[in-house]
């Protein structure tokens, strides 16, 4: 798998928050590629040396996933081809808070963007009529 080293693609993330004990979404989009097999998604977390998640050649590749994320991550595989690299994080923990990097490689080049993910016990505000 080769990429033309210095070409960059646009990657966009959105800061978000996750409710402890529930599932959360870390949003990331990128310039789509024609072939799914040419797309690599790598999610990284600041201070964590293993990968949060990796998706390549149309499927998850979790051999280098860090233990703290084992069994808790997934991408929306059917939406990767249209440029959606968002990560689903199951059973959000307090320690999941921090800075994440969404790193994308395609046949057009590579790109990345960071996002801040907050965690806590959030509740929907009650509206009294």
């Amino acid at each position: 798998f080769g990429i033309s080293g210095r070409h960059s693609i646009t990657v966009t993330t959105v800061a978000s928050a996750g409710n402890i004990g529930e599932d959360g979404i870390l949003s990331c989009t990128f310039e789509p590629d024609i072939k799914l097999s040419d797309i690599v998604i790598q999610w990284l977390k600041e201070g964590v040396l293993g990968l949060v998640h990796e998706f390549k050649e149309g499927k998850d590749e979790l051999s280098e996933q860090d233990e703290m994320f084992r069994g808790r991550t997934a991408v929306f595989a059917d939406q990767v081809i249209v440029g959606n690299a968002s990560l689903r994080l199951k059973n959000v923990q307090l320690t999941d808070a921090g800075t994440y990097k969404c790193y994308i490689i395609t046949s057009k080049g590579k790109g990345n963007a960071n996002l801040e993910y907050k965690t806590g016990a959030f509740s929907m505000p009650e509206v009294n009529v």
């Epitope: 210095r6 600041e46 964590v48 490689i105």
Partner: antibody
Amino acid sequence: EVQLLESGGGLVQPGGSLRLSCAASGFTFNTHAMHWVRQAPGKGLEWVSAISGSGGSTYYADSVKGRFTISRDISKNTLYLQMNSLRAEDTAVYYCARLLGRFGEYGMDVWGQGTTVTVSS
Amino acid sequence: DIQMTQSPSSLSASVGDRVTITCRASQNIYTWLAWYQQKPGKAPKLLIYDATNLPTGVPSRFSGSGSGTDFTLTISSLQPEDFATYYCQQSYSTRWTFGGGTKVEIK
């Protein structure tokens, strides 16, 4: 000035123990992952162990797993390598090194001067 | 573990020569590759990170290229202070591994 200074090396008998220290200065210690790398006499570089910035995750080469323990004391800005059950093949210069980048994907940009460990009877 | 194979293991060159060292990974490591220079009795020095990027203070005669499994370190015009041993290192896996080294000697 960003600096790493190792200490604790010396001559030890096979089966013995040593604790190496690496004092860090000039940077925010707890935001960087740290490594220990060794170099046997006349040989190449061999990665030994790593620890995340928080100290929550540790990693070891198969050759030292179960014998060596990496740790860090953020209040003292110091990295440690506890070496037990030492063998002749652990004889080397041991370097501590700082990992460049916030996400662990880059190289080791700051190195100490090294401390020599000799395991011999 | 990911194996890193460097070639050649040693080479002789003259000041002003263009020198190329190659590093091959046993599996795809994308651009998670660094190059180091080490002189006798000294600690290694980072030359290149992320396969192509030079840290501040590294002379521009050093350059890195490649992605996937094949990588190259090039010294465009060898200087007297460049005679040393060079190592590649991958950080894709959390079992970090170095290449065996390439010793650059004076012809």
